[in-house]
């Protein structure tokens, strides 16, 4: 339904608080380097303008699109050229090209300082002194570091952030109350950001059809009692929501997400029996809860799939009449029967089925040709099952840190051209699959593991896309969304790689390592491990383990020495010499 003023419409739908928060997120995701105060000023100006439009929708400029209004506002930033370089050229374009230009300049790895958490008393004072500014600052800092963060979900995080401070700043032991909550929000936030990044990559790099296929499979697993028509409606609406958020249309996205949650709750009976608790919650919690809801129980006595999709003489007729609808039905029927499969596996099966029909429906005897199509699924199912079994065994044997190290070596040998920080970050996250998924029973392992790996490998893909250095990474990232993980799994050692020159400076450490947290110290060691492999890609596991043991012993010894810096200098020389000898550098 058309509105005279889009900005007034969204302001009225969302309310002032959410409107301001979402505009701040949108601006911070576009102009990631701008100071907080500048963004607040821009948001206040937009909000005041929106209020004039609410009062009179016919007022000057109120009929302009949100992209036009927001883009014009962003283009008033005085330091655009100095701070952002060529992004300033976006301002010379007209909509919709200007917004596309801004989107293309979003930076997945902005050069921003790490967020350092102040002392609890300092945070509580800041919270009490100006709660509104404190919470806006949270939105700003997360949004600029995560330019694809799902905006309505960020509002939910901010609500929890506020609740944590409200409760804990009054507690007897503020730190004991607050710090675990902040750690949990940080970890959940990173996971949420990465999951949304995959959705946006799916839409932007592989198109709406790819996203819809993913959504059909996931929603069919989650709502196996729902009819295909119901699932299709949810998929269409969900696709609209995510297309908007990924496109920077955050007001529309949040508004449509609220409408979708409302629809789901009003139609629970025909969707899922698991939604009752979610639907009793307030809006932000409700939407989050629905997105995370457990799979409903499968209907009893579902018939065999073979009847409609293999044995029927009408397979090619039904396929020809409406290809995507028929494939959608196949995917829906397969997914609702297989909550034990990963979404990407279900999509591989659907792709195999599609390829078979394309070939067989043009053959002399189509039925004879596609009769054994389900047999082709077996190796596709067994491959992730075997991989997960092997890696969970390795994880259980090694523990998380050593499992991460094994993956660091594996991936550095596969793609040694990738930057060391990216290899460390991605391999650490790949290694977390063990603690996250291996504890689950067999029936839940694959959806947990392989769909999580898709999210992590997407991080590698988006970071690599910014500065491409490896044709093999580009190939695995761009050829097929659902085959990314098998593509990376299949990579062997890169025999074309010319080892890095040995640089003693890379392996020179100082006393500052002693004050780091255990996690940061692990990252230092893992950084050294990647560098070792880049210097000596043919090093055996045993050689690398031995050098890493030397390194750990070195850090441990010097961190308890009285004169730490002297110890690091003297023992460091011995360490480098022994490492060179051991690896033949």
């Amino acid at each position: 339904d058309a509105h005279k003023s889009e900005v007034a419409h969204r302001f009225k739908d969302l309310g002032e608080e959410n409107f301001k928060a979402l505009v701040l997120i949108a601006f911070a995701q576009y102009l990631q380097q701008c100071p907080f105060e500048d963004h607040v000023k821009l948001v206040n100006e937009v909000t005041e303008f929106a209020k004039t439009c609410v009062a009179d929708e016919s007022a000057e400029n109120c009929d302009k699109s949100l992209h036009t209004l927001f883009g014009d506002k962003l283009c008033t930033v005085a330091t655009l050229r100095e701070t952002y370089g060529e992004m300033a050229d976006c301002c010379a374009k007209q909509e919709p090209e200007r917004n596309e230009c801004f989107l293309q300049h979003k930076d997945d790895n902005p050069n921003l300082p790490r967020l350092v958490r102040p002392e609890v008393d300092v945070m509580c004072t800041a919270f009490h002194d100006n709660e509104e500014t404190f919470l806006k600052k949270y939105l700003y800092e997360i949004a600029r570091r995560h330019p694809y963060f799902y905006a309505p979900e960020l509002l939910f995080f901010a609500k929890r952030y506020k609740a944590a401070f409200t409760e804990c700043c009054q507690a007897a032991d503020k730190a004991a109350c607050l710090l675990p909550k902040l750690d949990e929000l940080r970890d959940e936030g990173k996971a949420s950001s990465a999951k949304q990044r995959l959705k946006c990559a799916s839409l932007q790099k592989f198109g709406e059809r790819a996203f819809k296929a993913w959504a059909v499979a996931r929603l069919s697993q989650r709502f196996p009692k729902a009819e295909f028509a119901e699932v299709s409606k949810l998929v269409t609406d969900l696709t609209k929501v995510h297309t908007e958020c990924c496109h920077g249309d955050l007001l529309e996205c949040a508004d449509d997400r609220a409408d979708l949650a409302k629809y789901i709750c009003e139609n629970q009976d025909s969707i899922s029996s698991k939604l009752k608790e979610c639907c009793e919650k307030p809006l932000l919690e409700k939407s989050h809860c629905i997105a995370e809801v457990e799979n409903d129980e499968m209907p009893a006595d579902l018939p065999s799939l073979a009847a409609d999709f293999v044995e029927s003489k009408d397979v090619c007729k039904n396929y020809a009449e409406a290809k995507d609808v028929f494939l959608g039905m196949f995917l829906y029927e397969y997914a609702r029967r297989h909550p034990d499969y990963s979404v990407v596996l279900l999509l591989r099966l659907a792709k195999t089925y599609e390829t078979t029909l394309e070939k067989c429906c043009a053959a002399a005897d189509p039925h004879e040709c596609y009769a054994k199509v389900f047999d082709e699924f077996k190796p596709l199912v067994e491959e992730p099952q075997n991989l997960i079994k092997q890696n969970c065994e390795l994880f259980e044997q090694l523990g998380e840190y050593k499992f991460q190290n094994a993956l660091l070596v594996r991936y550095t040998k596969k793609v040694p051209q990738v930057s060391t920080p990216t290899l460390v970050e991605v391999s650490r996250n790949l290694g977390k699959v063990g603690s996250k998924c291996c504890k689950h029973p067999e029936a839940k392992r694959m959806p947990c593991a392989e769909d999580y790996l898709s999210v992590v490998l997407n991080q590698l893909c988006v970071l690599h896309e910014k500065t491409p250095v490896s044709d093999r990474v580009t190939k695995c990232c761009t050829e097929s969304l659902v085959n990314r993980r098998p593509c990376f799994s299949a990579l062997e050692v890169d025999e074309t790689y010319v080892p890095k020159e040995f640089n003693a400076e890379t392996f020179t450490f100082h006393a500052d390592i002693c004050t780091l947290s255990e996690k940061e110290r692990q990252i230092k060691k893992q950084t050294a491990l990647v560098e070792l492999v880049k210097h000596k890609p043919k090093a055996t596991k045993e050689q690398l383990k031995a050098v890493m043991d030397d390194f750990a012993a070195f850090v441990e010894k010097c961190c308890k020495a009285d004169d730490k810096e002297t110890c690091f200098a003297e023992e460091g020389k011995k360490l480098v010499a022994a490492s060179q000898a051991a690896l033949g550098l």
Epitope: G399, Y401, K402, E542, K545, A546, V547, D549, D550, A552, A553, F554, E556, K557, E571, K574, L575, A577, A578, S579, A581, A582
Partner: nanobody
Amino acid sequence: QVQLVESGGELVQAGGSLRLSCVVSGRTFRTRTMGWFRQAPGKEREYVAHISANGPITDYSDSVKGRFAISRDNAKNTVNLQMNSLKPEDTAVYYCALHNGIGVRTVPSQYDSWGQGTQVTVSS
């Protein structure tokens, strides 16, 4: 299964020297820190020294620093402890152990494979 066998322990006069050896079976030897510990009657097991996998990093307890020297020969899967200027308070059963690859190297609980021990007695 890793096996560790110590040898070289005996009765020695104060001020004398001894060389303890430990032979390890199993491939993990070459990738892990090896440590020596000792336990005197009625006392807790205490840390003596350790040496990292390739040998560049060695460390000692304050009570033996300057008198004992740890070394290893990865080709022969052995770790040695050269003990000089022995004192009666060095009397104990000496154990060699294979580090678990993660924990603090001066703590017995962070070693997951142990030998049976060899008795060292220093008489005054």
